[in-house]
């Protein structure tokens, strides 16, 4: 039978129901988010019941980890002031129906926030009754009932192995510690080119075959397990196993990486072109213009041979470049007349050339005296 509630005391908190006021309490949802939509309405109760309400105690949530130990936890921070709540438990309708005190509390910031029960204290197929109580206010107590077979969370699958059954068929195998036949599994796999996982449910046999494998792609597999449906009806899955890989390491890169590479190359190329243009314009500004032979005649004519005027070199710099040796003018003719051009012969200058173009003055070095 159900155990009676622990003794009550008369200390009561707030006379809110008499005023018709609702108590809005923030509670934590399983994913850790706050749920403020759950208003704890303090409404009409049976005639003999309390005329004054007590604050509700936090809910207890229990999980049985691989049937090795069980953690029952509560949100200790929901209490209006730090309170070391106590936990008692028993099993309904069984040889284990004696009320037990928690012998191993879990703490959060030095306040009790859970209880850990060891394997010998876990009886999966008997109704587990857990009672949370405020020791300073024993009337504040809450008794919950739980079906532990629906609260089992197995360890993640281990030792994933892949075997090639044929040229295009792969088989994935794995192990689970202790709970093999009680578990169902979920296999997920994808290639480097896939955006999302493909998943496949697998029964207690813990093996999975992939009938058509592309040898050019690299595959990743992972597995998780759940205590369902043969031995219980648990909703929570285990953690994912460590992934295992199969296939060509030289396969085409991930499309995201490929796209990233393309962007980097494009941006890099643009950057290089812009840099070169900057260097070009900088050189254009700082370096003297060097004429092509094609327009040299026009320049010489226009500036009457004044090199510094059209070259962009300042007058001072031009003067400092003046040589301190004597120059010898070399005349250049278009087509030499028969009998040879001026300057030909043994004493002729080596600068004498047959050219249709004007050439810059030809210098003969004269040693300093």
């Amino acid at each position: 039978m159900l155990k009676p509630s622990l003794p009550f005391t008369s200390l009561l908190f707030l006379q809110l129901p008499l005023l018709g006021v609702g108590l809005n309490t923030t509670i934590l949802t399983p994913n850790g988010n706050e749920d403020t939509t759950a208003d704890f309405f303090l409404t009409t109760m049976p005639t003999d019941s309390l005329s004054v309400s007590t604050l509700p105690l936090p809910e207890v949530q229990c999980f049985v980890f691989n049937v090795e130990y069980m953690n029952c936890t509560w949100n200790s921070s929901s209490e209006p002031q730090p309170t070391n709540l106590t936990l008692h438990y028993w099993y309904k309708n069984s040889d284990n129906d004696k009320v037990q005190k928690c012998s191993h509390y879990l703490f959060s910031e030095e306040i009790t926030s859970g209880c850990q029960l060891q394997k010998k204290e876990i009886h999966l197929y008997q109704t587990f009754v857990v009672q949370l109580q405020d020791p300073r206010e024993p009337r504040r107590q809450a008794t919950q009932m739980l079906k532990l077979q629906n609260l089992v969370i197995p360890w993640a699958p281990e030792n994933l192995t892949l075997h090639k059954l044929s040229e295009s068929q792969l088989e994935l195998n794995w192990n689970n510690r202790f709970l093999n036949h009680c578990l169902e599994h979920l296999v997920q796999y994808r290639t480097d080119w896939d955006h999302s996982w493909t998943e496949q449910s697998v029964d207690y046999r813990h093996k999975f075959s992939l009938p058509s494998v592309d040898g050019q792609k690299r595959y990743t597999f992972r597995v998780r397990s759940r205590f369902n449906p043969l031995c219980g009806s648990a909703q929570h899955w285990s953690e994912w196993s460590h992934p295992i890989h199969w296939g060509s390491n030289t396969s085409k890169e991930n499309p995201f990486l490929f796209a990233l590479e393309a962007v980097v190359i494009s941006v890099g190329s643009m950057g290089l072109i812009i840099s070169l243009l900057c260097v070009y314009f900088w050189l254009e500004r700082t370096m003297p213009r060097i004429p092509t032979l094609k327009n040299l005649e026009d320049l010489v004519t226009e500036y009457h041979g004044n090199f510094s005027a059209w070259s962009g070199v300042s007058k001072g710099l031009a003067e400092s470049l003046q040589p301190d040796y004597s120059e010898r003018l070399c005349l250049v003719s278009e087509i030499p007349p028969k009998g040879g051009a001026l300057g030909e012969g043994p004493g002729a200058s080596p600068c004498n050339q047959h050219s249709p173009y004007w050439a810059p003055p030809c210098y003969t070095l004269k040693p300093e005296t």
């Epitope: 504040r140 809450a142 919950q144």
Partner: nanobody, 126 residues
Framework: QVQLVESGGGLVQAGGSLRLSCAAS????????MGWFRQAPGKEREFVAA???????FYADSVEGRFTFSRDNAKNAVYLQMNSLQPEDTAVYYC????????????????????WGQGTQVTVSS
Amino acid sequence: QVQLVESGGGLVQAGGSLRLSCAASGRTLSRDAMGWFRQAPGKEREFVAADSWGGDTFYADSVEGRFTFSRDNAKNAVYLQMNSLQPEDTAVYYCAGAPTSFATTAYSSSNSYRYWGQGTQVTVSS
């Protein structure tokens, strides 16, 4: 404001059956723990049955195998099917609810419930 209204009580011969209904207004019950309690004249209120919104149902030893708790979220109601009624089942039956975060929470303690109905009388004659 949440309102629970029980119906379906009455006078029945021993061995007979009744189906109690509890309809809610002002709140959706689909994520609440729900319970049935009863109080016989001169006795304390006692737990009869409870249900978590995840679907786990629990019964007091005295009614196990005879009573069945069910809920219909579409109708925002819960039910208690009572078979093989005995004179000791005579009491006022109350429906109660509590908002809960976890699908597995089911309470057998009356002070864990936040809102209650006014009750419906069940009398079993021998």
